[in-house]
């Protein structure tokens, strides 16, 4: 066969459906990989074909699109599951060609099987939820295209295995579940279960999603650095370990890109040649509030290097803040034979 | 017995306040409730007022009509929810329930009512 | 703003009679719609929730029925302690949470 450009397998685009259920799944080479879609494509001549390799096998074989009921089939871009079964799992491959052209990519998807709980080796998109900030919703994600606008499905949400009614905080309204209130006790795996006709038959769609609440915006403040601070001070003799922690409480931010820094003498700790080293920890709070500390040791401090300024520093997408260590030497404790005895009048 | 038991009616003059109270006895009004206000005009039917969510925070809700001149509040330490009304008007006149449930909106427990008449 | 319409606003019934309420939302509300009953000088009582749910402690010649736009209180048997007003209560979160109570329905000895 001619050369064929060949995207590889795809194993960014992870596809899983569960099983017993549709699955559509669009060829990724529209989405990610060519500049024209599928329409131009089909006007300009060029012909879709599908082929799949079984899970633990390594032929390439056609899909059997004469299934009964039209199990698996083709619509323009989109390869159909009504519905999915478990031997589904492989990795498929969309050839989009003519006699001068060829262009194809392979991607795995695997069907997964779920228990009543809903429970599954899925991976759950997370949706955030600012805490106690009025009305927020999460929706129901990937049921567009499974039926038309004309047919009305029904909608069932759960949490975890309980089916959600008005009930607290909770709202559901058909595809959306709104939150008059999101608290803490809201975190947690959230289930639409979509159910509509067609042809006869009656289908289900299974959307699980984990729902996180973290800081609200209302709340936010500019980093607060905890450590270093006025009330103490880090008095070294020359040769021990001077060691300094920076700790600094930011509140959570959507998007916001946290970041702590140590200046010496007011050059980053690369720029300068004292052996330095910077160790560097991360904790967060049920909120996503984050607490940074970075540690700055070394290891055999000189009188040099006690007169220098250390000042860690901090910033968000609310502000940058600094704040300065307060680092000395040590006065000598007095030897007592000599410095003592003088001090007595000794001779 | 859970019960929910409402003071501070009366007859104010138009422009003026006046404080409802509804003490709850029986269960915690930090438990996760919403606390509502509801009111019934002489001979009219039921029109919610506002609601407030005991279980975490204050978030409140409001009708539209109320246009900030009433402010719902808890004090959690007395089991006490509160409706302050100012601007009163004379279509304010009504008695004034507070109600509470577990659902937004599905009231299972509500008070015994106090008027409120606003007229000079 | 949700605005919920009763029908009928009155009725006249006898005991053992098949009573039907209809309660019209003007925004789809889903299945969040409560019904309760009132009688004179006393606070209302809740009867229905999510639609079809009974309260706790309700007889159950009263049941519910509906979603989205429109909705049926049902009592299958009118006895004598029913003669009063029912009122319907939407719930909706378009842009901020409503509540909305329709006009009541006085349902009267015939």
């Known amino acids: 066969s001619e050369r064929c450009d060949d995207w590889g397998l795809d194993t960014m685009r992870q596809i899983q459906v569960f099983e017993d259920e549709p699955a559509r799944i669009k060829c990724p080479l529209f989405e990610h990989f060519l500049k024209f879609n599928y329409s131009t494509a089909h006007s300009a001549g060029l012909t879709l074909i599908w082929y799949w390799t079984r899970q633990d096998r390594d032929l390439e074989e056609p899909i059997n699109f004469r299934l009964p009921e039209n199990r698996i089939s083709k619509e323009k871009d989109v390869l159909w599951f009504r519905p999915t079964l478990l031997n589904d799992t492989g990795n498929y491959t969309c050839m989009l060609r003519n006699t001068t052209y060829c262009s194809k990519v392979a991607f795995p998807l695997e069907v997964v099987q779920k228990d009543s709980c809903f429970n599954s080796p899925m991976k759950l998109p997370v949706h955030k939820l600012y805490i106690e900030y009025g009305i927020q919703r999460i929706t129901c994600p990937n049921v567009d295209g499974y039926f038309p606008s004309s047919v009305k499905p029904t909608i069932t949400w759960y949490m975890g295995c309980y089916k959600i009614q008005n009930f607290n905080n909770v709202i559901p309204e058909g595809m959306n579940l709104s939150f008059l209130i999101a608290l803490i006790s809201n975190n947690g795996n959230y289930t639409c279960v979509v159910t509509y006709p067609e042809n006869g038959r009656t289908f289900h769609l299974t959307r699980t999603l984990t729902v996180k609440v973290v800081g609200s915006p209302k709340n936010a403040v500019p980093p607060v650095i905890h450590s270093p601070n006025d009330h103490v001070v880090y008095e070294k003799e020359p040769g021990e370990e001077l060691l300094i922690p920076c700790t600094v409480y930011f509140s959570f931010l959507m998007d916001s890109r946290n970041e702590v820094w140590w200046t010496i003498d007011g050059k980053k700790p690369d720029d300068i040649t004292i052996d330095v080293t910077i160790n560097e920890s991360i904790s967060h709070s049920r909120t996503e509030d984050e607490t940074r500390t970075q540690i700055l040791s070394i290891k055999k401090v000189t009188s040099e290097d006690l007169k220098r300024s250390y000042v860690c520093h901090a910033r968000s997408a609310k502000g940058e803040v600094a704040k300065a260590a307060k680092v000395k030497q040590k006065v000598p404790a007095p030897r007592y034979t000599v410095e003592l005895a003088c001090g007595f009048g000794a001779t | 017995e859970v019960q929910l038991e409402q003071s501070g009616g009366g007859l104010v003059q138009p422009g003026g306040s006046l404080r409802l109270s509804c003490a709850a006895s029986g269960f915690s009004l930090s438990t996760s409730y919403w606390r509502c206000w509801v009111r019934q005009a002489p001979g009219k039917g039921l029109e919610w007022v506002a609601c407030?969510?005991?279980?975490?925070?204050?978030?409140?809700y409001y009708a539209n009509w109320v246009n900030g001149r009433f402010t719902i509040s808890r004090d959690n330490s007395k089991s006490t929810l509160y409706l302050q009304m100012n601007s009163l008007r004379a279509e304010d006149t009504a008695v004034y329930y507070c109600?509470?449930?577990?659902?937004?909106?599905?009231?299972?427990?509500w008070g015994q009512g106090t008027l409120v008449t606003v007229s000079s | 703003e949700l605005v919920m319409t009763q029908s009928p606003s009155s009725l006249s019934a006898s005991v053992g009679d098949r009573v039907t309420i209809t309660c019209q939302a003007s925004e789809d509300i889903y299945s969040n719609l409560a019904w309760f009953q009132q009688k004179p000088g006393q606070a209302p009582k809740l009867l229905i929730y999510d639609a079809s749910t009974l309260a706790s402690g309700v007889p159950s010649r009263f049941s519910g029925s509906g979603s989205g736009t429109e909705f049926t209180l049902t009592i299958s048997s009118l006895q004598p302690e029913d003669f009063a007003t029912y009122y319907c209560?939407?719930?909706?979160?378009?842009?901020?949470?409503?509540?909305?109570f329709g006009g009541g329905t006085k349902v009267e000895i015939k």
């Open positions: 109600a509470s449930g577990v659902g937004f909106g599905y009231f299972n427990l």
């Open positions: 407030i969510y005991a279980g975490s925070g204050d978030v409140t």
């Open positions: 209560l939407g719930v909706y979160t378009h842009i901020s949470a409503d509540n909305a």
